[in-house]
């Protein structure tokens, strides 16, 4: 079986302040089972942006219906972007476990925020 890959097609995305940013991510397989999470930054201090499994993320919505059993599109949309949202975002696949085990990360998408047009 081909090894699962996590694909973030855009290296960078630029969005005007106040608008929404779409961060694209697809996986090449649903196996092994386990959730997808989005983070900003890397390492122990990385910030959780979205968790497929749980949590309340009022500014983040999945682009595709995550309840589809064959869904492999884990793209997200972040609303009302501010300069504080700038950074590199990573889509990370986990394998189920206690706790879940990080399996594969996308290459990252750098979000830059332009000043709001006057």
């Amino acid at each position: 079986e081909e090894e699962l890959q996590v694909i973030q097609p855009e290296k960078s995305v630029s969005v005007a302040a106040g608008e929404s940013a779409t961060l694209n991510c697809t996986a090449t397989s649903l196996i092994p089972v386990g959730p997808i999470q989005w983070f900003r930054g890397v390492g122990p201090g990385r910030e959780l942006i979205y968790h497929q499994k749980e949590g309340h993320f009022p500014r983040v919505t999945p682009v595709s219906d995550p309840t589809k059993r064959n869904n492999m599109d884990f793209s997200i949309r972040i609303s009302n972007i501010t300069p504080a949202d700038a950074g590199t975002y990573y889509c990370v696949k986990f394998r189920k476990g206690s706790p879940d085990v990080e399996l594969k990360s996308g290459a990252g998408t750098e979000l830059s925020v332009r000043a709001k047009p006057s």
Epitope: I31, P32, V33, P35, D65, R69, N70
Partner: antibody
């Protein structure tokens, strides 16, 4: 509190049709996939069909494919199961169940009894 | 198909373990459903292998490894008498399956 209330069961003759309903309350119905599960007298649980939150994707066990149809109306927070060409083997209590993020079930209705008898 | 024992029994206060086998660890998530009488509404006591809903007592726990899942009831009580069904979701086939059920008798 999450509540799921099935209705539409009853006694029908072999070959007839029936439509079951499940009224949901206490949660955002349009955010959850849903399923139908049945239990024949003295038997175990049998999953029949599932539907994604948006209603575009449906899934069935092979034995009811083409004969049963799952659907939903998010504006009414309602789930449905249309059952055609019923046989005595379809006699069971039919439950609707809310799906977790990974397609297991976290809440169940009280069930509605369908009896197929001549 | 998921396989579980037909029955188990225990004295109050003992620890009960019910196993469920037959799923592939890498493609299957497990859950445990409690049914106190035939035809009554099942209650989910564990889902996602080891996650306990907030209204379920902490004496219920779950685990999964290899091709099996286990429901553990630590300090079993008389009110835990029920049939316990293991359930699985297979990410390869998109299908839900159930075991035949285990009748727990608390002596």
């Amino acid at each position: 509190d999450v509540q799921l209330v099935e209705s539409g069961g009853g006694v029908v003759r072999p070959g007839e049709s029936l439509r079951l309903s499940c009224a949901a309350s206490g949660f955002t119905f349009s955010s959850h996939a849903m399923s139908w599960v049945r239990q024949a007298p003295g038997k175990g649980l049998e999953w029949l069909a599932g539907i994604s939150a948006g209603g575009s994707d449906t899934y069935y066990i092979d034995s009811v494919k083409g004969r049963f149809t799952i659907s939903r109306d998010n504006s009414k927070s309602s789930l449905y199961l249309r059952m055609n060409s019923l046989t005595a083997e379809d006699t069971a209590v039919y439950y609707c169940a809310r799906e977790t993020w990974n397609h297991l079930f976290d809440y169940w209705g009280l069930g509605t009894l369908v009896t197929v008898s001549s | 198909a998921l396989t579980q024992p037909a029955s188990v029994s225990a004295n109050p206060g003992e620890t009960v373990k019910i196993t469920c086998s037959g799923g592939d660890y890498y493609s299957t998530y497990y859950a445990w459903y409690q049914q106190k009488s035939p035809g009554s509404a099942p209650v989910t006591v564990i889902h996602s292998d080891d996650e306990r809903p907030s209204d379920i007592p902490s004496r219920f726990s779950g685990s999964a490894s290899g091709s099996a899942a286990t429901l553990i009831i630590t300090g079993v009580r008389v009110e835990d008498e029920a049939v316990y069904f293991c359930g699985g979701y297979d990410g390869r086939t998109y299908i839900n399956t159930f075991g035949a059920g285990t009748t727990l008798t608390v002596l």
